[in-house]
Interface confidence: medium
């Protein structure tokens, strides 16, 4: 004969546990139904009646099968430096992540507690390490032969164009200016010179020249921790 199916509430066999999506109620000493995600236990079970579940109220949730008397409160609204990547529903908490241009300086179990703006590398400095969701940008001085003329959290140092005739030599914060339209590959000994790249980046207008003080090998070493303020600007 097939085993009889027990309906909640029921007394478990000695030494056995309740089934999936059931819990053992210590007061009733019975196996009782859990409430589904998005619900909570409004009335606990007795020896003769099963758990009575009710929907979570607005701004509260339960994510798991449960028998909690009250739903959990959703987290506070996302701050201005965050975006809501998961809305508060009856079944899930609100998740806030940092908006573009920011990174998570202090994370929590899900989402971010504190966002901070990504460091911007000033002209003469380029991105050595791009920002991630949880780490800031690292800037580095543009090496001889390269430049950055932007204040940006994404731009790397770019190569100077190589001129047939140089009108204005390039430096760390400005491209070379040519008097001829056809660049050549002639190079000054010891300088780092590169061609214009095949690039999808937009070209920027050039600021007033400023001398490069970057040591010639500063960008060539494997990147370790970098002084946060070097070559960077706040928002």
């Amino acid at each position: 004969l097939p085993a009889q199916v027990a309906f909640t509430p029921y007394a478990p066999e000695p030494g056995s546990t309740c089934r999936l999506r059931e819990y053992y109620d210590q007061t009733a000493q019975m196996c009782c139904s859990k409430c589904s995600p998005g619900q909570h236990a409004k009335v606990f079970c007795t020896k003769t009646s099963d758990t009575v579940c009710d929907s979570c109220e607005d701004s509260t949730y339960t994510q798991l099968w449960n028998w909690v008397p009250e739903c959990l409160s959703c987290g506070s609204r996302c701050s201005s430096d965050q975006v809501e990547t998961q809305a508060c529903t009856r079944e899930q908490n609100r998740i806030c992540t940092c908006r573009p241009g920011w990174y998570c300086a202090l994370s929590k179990q899900e989402g971010c507690r504190l966002c901070a703006p990504l460091r911007k590398c000033r002209p003469g400095f380029g991105v050595a390490r791009p920002g991630t969701e949880t780490s800031d940008v690292v800037c580095k001085p543009c090496a001889p032969g390269t430049f950055s003329n932007t204040t940006s959290s994404t731009d790397i140092c770019r190569p100077h164009q190589i001129c047939n005739v140089v009108a204005i030599p390039g430096n760390a914060s400005m491209d070379a200016v040519c008097t001829s339209t056809s660049p050549t590959r002639s190079m000054a000994p010891g300088a780092v010179h590169l061609p214009q790249p095949v690039s999808t980046r937009s070209q920027h207008t050039q600021p007033t020249p400023e001398p490069s003080t970057a040591p010639s090998t500063s960008f060539l070493l494997p990147m370790g921790p970098s002084p946060p303020a070097e070559g960077s600007t706040g928002d």
């Epitope: 390269t146 010639s216 090998t217 960008f219 060539l220 494997p222 990147m223």
Partner: antibody, heavy 121, light 107 residues
């Protein structure tokens, strides 16, 4: 540990195309420039192409300019080299190599094992 | 482009002896020079960068020196596993260029 695994090599006729791939693992792929370097049989090393960490800046050796393109898919940790209009002199082992940082001028701290491309009629 | 030359083409050294390899640039590359080791059937491996800085995990018997146009790689006490071709590479000027290599044989 850092691993670079090239694939896509083979025998191809002159004028035809081939696409090489390099699967990267063991490091944060999307913050490093990546390069292709080749080595003809019994010969030395020749730098071929470089792509910046974000894929926006690309550089090529004169010998392949206009025929080869380099690209990357940071979501798949994969580097590509599309080789068109192949010539006999493109026959070589092609290595992908990791740049030491995002700088456009750099040396290579890790190399793949290489994939052989043979261009022959 | 900067042309890199290496000498000798082949170097035969007994185990335990010193091996000295030379690399010359056609114009100054400051100290922007790297050395690579390529064992038979293997990919190149970075040994030295910035002319004299040993890469991670490289034994102390390998050392680099020089700046400008003249560079030297020294293996102070040659081991049998050092049988390889050694390449220098400049990364000061465009395009990146390698030397033709020096093959180190065990006598």
């Amino acid at each position: 540990q850092v691993q670079l695994v090239e694939s896509g090599g083979g025998v191809v006729h002159p004028g035809k195309s081939l696409r090489l791939s390099c699967a990267a693992s063991g490091f944060t792929f999307n913050i490093y420039g990546m390069h292709w370097v080749r080595q003809a049989p019994g010969k030395g090393l020749e730098w071929v192409a470089l792509i910046s960490y974000d894929g926006n800046d690309k550089y090529f050796a004169d010998s392949v300019k206009g025929r080869f393109t380099i690209s990357r898919d940071n979501s798949k940790n994969t580097l590509y080299l599309q080789m068109n209009s192949l010539r006999a002199e493109d026959t070589a082992v092609y290595y992908c190599a990791k740049a030491v940082d995002t700088a456009v001028v750099t040396f290579f701290d890790y190399w793949g094992q290489g994939t052989l491309v043979t261009v022959s009629s | 482009e900067i042309v890199m030359t290496q000498s000798p083409v082949t170097l035969s050294v007994s185990p335990g002896e010193r091996a000295t390899l030379s690399c010359r640039a056609s114009q100054s590359v400051s100290s922007n020079l790297a050395w690579y080791q390529q064992k038979p059937g293997q990919a190149p491996r970075l040994l030295i960068y910035s002319a004299s800085t040993r890469a991670t995990g490289i034994p102390a018997r390998f050392s680099g020196s020089g700046s400008g146009t003249e560079f030297t790689l020294t293996i102070s006490s040659l081991q049998s596993e050092d049988l390889a071709v050694y390449y220098c590479q400049q990364y000061s000027n465009w395009p990146f260029t390698f030397g033709p290599g020096t093959k180190v044989d065990i006598k």
